[in-house]
């Protein structure tokens, strides 16, 4: 994929609210492009933070503007929905909300949308088409929860048109305007440590592969051209530079360690993958 | 800077016809739902129609459901009204306004004036 | 449908006066009220949106409240320009409704 992320791909924003007791609540909101955060919320100004050069798309000032009220008047329509119906729905204090909404692109085209509300953690409610509907596991709260949010059905063909309508329009002027910077392409450094020792007589070989951009990445410990199945790759964690790291261990006797190698294929190397041999391993690739 | 111009107002005679534009720019028109609100001579406010951006949701008033028809052309930046069977009690000024997302009418026309007589 | 009330349906005031004009909704509402100035052979011009919030432009001494069903427009100065009809509108259902209508008069 040229933009370099992972088709397919989504725009989404998350609203994160927490009701410590009747008076006393918090709000975090944020906007991801897939696993890239562009945006965020300033509560005390009550505006759209944009956190890349290109986070505006192609959207006008008016139209930023506009959201900006939208965001600020909703927050406060749903905290005052909340606290009032908190009882009702046997909302227990302290708990917490999360609201996810977006709208997924494939090969250049919208392939639909989502807005999800989990209560406690645990999915409660999503919104299909024109309407929010329950989820059957999560009862009859869910169930009088989208008869209270069904109320407003102007509303409900908003939120619809915000979905489908303003979020792709959206996410393509995003990908636009920030083209060369997901397009770009930047290398992997990797180096070797010693990781905490797994018993007597065995090593844990960490390869650690930081700073590259796109995410996609391919690590393995190698014997020769033989991968070893005992790899155990974490999660892809983002750096504060919007690049990625990854480690790959393997749990080895240490008799064991001298022939193996540490592999890294990534798009920015063009082929030339980083190989790195355990028995000098001060290298860095 | 927002304008939203009509047109299309004028004299007809009951069961007539007419049809209303408006012509809207200074804002991306293709993201805002949009509404016709009407006044009768000396009256109060009355809401008519209903369009959603790309024209997937609409709503009519009762007095008018079957007779107007709502629609848009968002390449173009019009929003039109088309009346058939018109009645005296149609007589009234048309305004096209434009809809915010927490649902406001934020800008309105200037209004064009229907009178249905005979 | 939702029906709105305003209360007074007109109301002589002086420059400097404080003018507060009523409505009242048949049932709740939450927020979801606006707030229109109209002047004679003009278009409605939205003041107050989502029952207090004013609208960008629109002098300071405008402000709403209320919340559920009863809302209040007030004018903590009346000016001369602000002599007009003034009409309260919700957005909670559709079909959307305003209210009948407060004019405000020079006494």
């Known amino acids: 994929n040229a933009d370099g992320l992972k088709e397919p791909l989504s725009f989404h924003v998350t609203w994160i609210a927490s009701f410590y007791n009747h008076s006393w609540k918090q709000n975090l909101v944020s906007g991801w492009l897939s696993d890239l955060q562009t945006h965020t919320w300033d509560s005390n100004s009550s505006t759209i933070v944009f956190l890349c050069p290109w986070s505006r798309g192609n959207f006008s000032n008016e139209e930023w503007k506009e959201l900006e009220t939208l965001f600020r008047i909703r927050t406060i329509r749903s905290f005052e929905g909340i606290r009032r119906y908190a009882h009702e729905l046997q909302f227990e204090y302290p708990f917490e909300i999360q609201v996810t909404g977006g709208c997924e692109l494939h090969s250049g085209k919208v392939s639909g949308s989502f807005l999800q509300l989990a209560y406690q953690g645990s999915d409660f409610v999503s919104f299909q088409n024109n309407s929010w509907l329950p989820y059957p596991v999560a009862g009859n709260m869910a169930k009088h929860f989208c008869k209270v949010l069904n109320q407003n059905q102007h509303e409900n063909d908003i939120t619809h048109n915000l979905l489908s309508d303003t979020c792709p329009r959206f996410i393509l002027g995003l990908l636009d305007a920030g083209k060369a910077h997901l397009q770009r392409q930047v290398k992997p450094e990797a180096w070797l440590s010693h990781g905490p020792s797994p018993g007597p007589g065995h090593l844990q070989l960490v390869c650690h592969v930081s700073g590259f951009y796109p995410k996609p990445v391919w690590v393995m410990w190698m014997r020769g051209e033989q991968e070893q199945q005992g790899t155990q790759r974490g999660d892809i964690l983002p750096s504060a530079d919007g690049t990625w790291y990854l480690r790959a261990t393997l749990e080895v006797a240490a008799g064991e360690a001298a022939d193996l190698s540490c592999r890294v294929k990534h798009s920015s190397l063009e082929g030339q993958d980083i190989v790195l041999y355990w028995e000098h391993h001060s290298s860095v690739g | 800077e927002v304008q939203l111009v009509e047109s299309g107002g004028g004299l007809v005679q009951p069961g007539g016809s007419l049809r209303l534009s408006c012509a809207a720019s200074g804002f991306t028109f293709s993201s805002y739902s949009m509404n016709w609100v009407r006044q009768a001579p000396g009256k109060g406010l009355e809401w008519v129609s209903y369009i959603s951006s790309s024209s997937s949701t609409i709503y009519y008033a009762d007095s008018v459901k079957g007779r107007f028809t709502i629609s848009r052309d968002n390449a173009k930046n019009s929003l039109y009204l088309q009346m058939n069977s018109l009645r005296d009690e149609d007589t009234a000024v048309y305004y096209c306004?434009?809809?915010?997302?927490?649902?406001?009418?934020?800008?309105w026309g200037q209004g064009t004036l229907v009178t249905v007589s005979s | 449908e939702i029906e709105l009330t305003q209360s007074p349906s007109s109301l002589s005031a002086s420059v400097g006066d404080r003018v507060t004009i009523t409505c009242r909704a048949s049932q709740s509402i939450s927020s979801y009220l606006n707030w229109y100035q109209q002047k004679p052979g003009k278009a409605p011009k939205l003041l107050i949106y989502a029952a207090s919030s004013l609208q960008s432009g629109v002098p300071s001494r405008f402000s709403g409240s209320g919340s559920g069903t009863d809302f209040t427009l007030t004018i903590s100065s009346l000016q001369p320009e602000d002599f007009a009809t003034y009409y309260c509108?919700?957005?909670?259902?559709?079909?959307?409704?305003f209210g009948q209508g407060t004019k405000v008069e020079i006494k």
């Open positions: 509108q919700q957005s909670y259902s559709t079909p959307p409704t």
């Open positions: 306004a434009k809809e915010t997302w927490w649902q406001s009418f934020d800008y």
